[in-house]
């Protein structure tokens, strides 16, 4: 009876279990009753990082110098190239597809530490009593306005993104 499931590192095709190609190799032809799976190594600048039945290898990532990228780790037949940014610049994401001078802290967050050549901006959430309503790479969280010191009262509570709104005290007639 033909199998309905195969072992690890195998795949089911034409009612039979064939071996997957190992990382660094692509599929040329499926196995048959009489022959093994045929695999070929990926070419220069190509890779496959899993046991697979792919008929094409993936191209290594290109670290575009026009985007500030350079090679951190050269790719192999089993691994993709890893890019990083030129010194003083920072990756926009884990995949490092482009570089920015420094990231900004979003509203609700303040700058804890300004970026340097080696470390990006460090942000921190604004605690109760403080707010930030801007995206910035240098502004800290600002304290809420003290209505009392202006002889006013709080008309609208502050949040981590907005200041309090002060207004006149209700005068008793």
């Amino acid at each position: 009876e033909p199998p309905t499931a195969c072992r690890e590192k195998q795949y089911l095709i034409n009612s039979q279990c064939c071996s997957l190609c190992q990382p660094g190799q692509k599929l040329v032809s499926d196995c048959t009753e009489f022959t093994e799976t045929e695999c070929l190594p990926c070419g220069e600048s190509e890779f496959l990082d899993t046991w697979n039945r792919e008929t094409h290898c993936h191209q290594h990532k290109y670290c575009d110098p026009n985007l500030g990228l350079r090679v951190q780790q050269k790719g192999t037949s089993e691994t993709d190239t890893i890019c990083t940014c030129e010194e003083g610049w920072h990756c926009t994401s884990e995949a490092c597809e482009s570089c920015v001078l420094h990231r900004s802290c979003s509203p609700g967050f303040g700058v804890k530490q300004i970026a340097t050549g080696v470390s990006d901006t460090i942000c921190e959430p604004c605690p109760v009593g403080f707010f930030s309503n801007v995206s910035s790479a240098f502004e800290k969280c600002h304290p809420w306005t003290s209505c009392e010191t202006k002889d006013l009262v709080v008309q609208q509570a502050g949040t981590n993104k907005t200041d309090v709104v002060c207004g006149p005290q209700d005068r008793l007639r």
């Epitope: 026009n66 985007l67 500030g68 940014c85 030129e86 610049w89 482009s98 570089c99 920015v100 001078l101 420094h102 990231r103 900004s104 801007v134 995206s135 910035s136 790479a137 240098f138 502004e139």
Partner: nanobody
Framework: EVQLLESGGGLVQPGGSLRLSCAAS????????MWWVRQAPGKGLERVSA????????YYADSVKGRFTISRDNSKNTLYLQMNSLRAEDTAVYYC?????????RGQGTLVTVSS
């Protein structure tokens, strides 16, 4: 396309002054935080000064505090850096930058050389 054109650099003696300008185009200048950064020969990028979109809040690196003043004219789409009491260690290429600045958006910079 973002364009930032720095000017005003040159050779100046220690203790002298220079005013750098940065003409911005290709984006709404008044909406963006702006920065001056510099790169000395053989050194990394140093963040020198920054200003918020309205020009009401500023930042200065400790190395330039009290000597440099950042300002902006939103009606002219221009950023400025007034540099006084210049020192040899201020020698660098100065770049202006918007937030965020992608590598491909950077200007050519203007060279400031402080030497007697």
């Amino acid at each position: 396309e973002v364009q930032l054109l720095e000017s005003g650099g040159g050779l100046v003696q220690p203790g002298g002054s220079l005013r750098l300008s940065c003409a911005a185009s290709g984006f709404t200048f008044r909406d963006y935080e702006m920065w001056w950064v510099r790169q000395a020969p053989g050194k990394g990028l140093e963040r020198v000064s920054a200003i918020n979109p309205q020009g009401t809040r500023t930042y200065y690196a400790d190395s330039v505090k009290g000597r440099f003043t950042i300002s902006r004219d939103n009606s002219k789409n221009t950023l400025y850096l007034q540099m006084n009491s210049l020192r040899a260690e201020d020698t660098a290429v100065y770049y202006c930058a918007k937030l965020p600045t992608y590598f491909s958006d950077r200007g050519q910079g203007t060279l400031v050389t402080v030497s007697s």
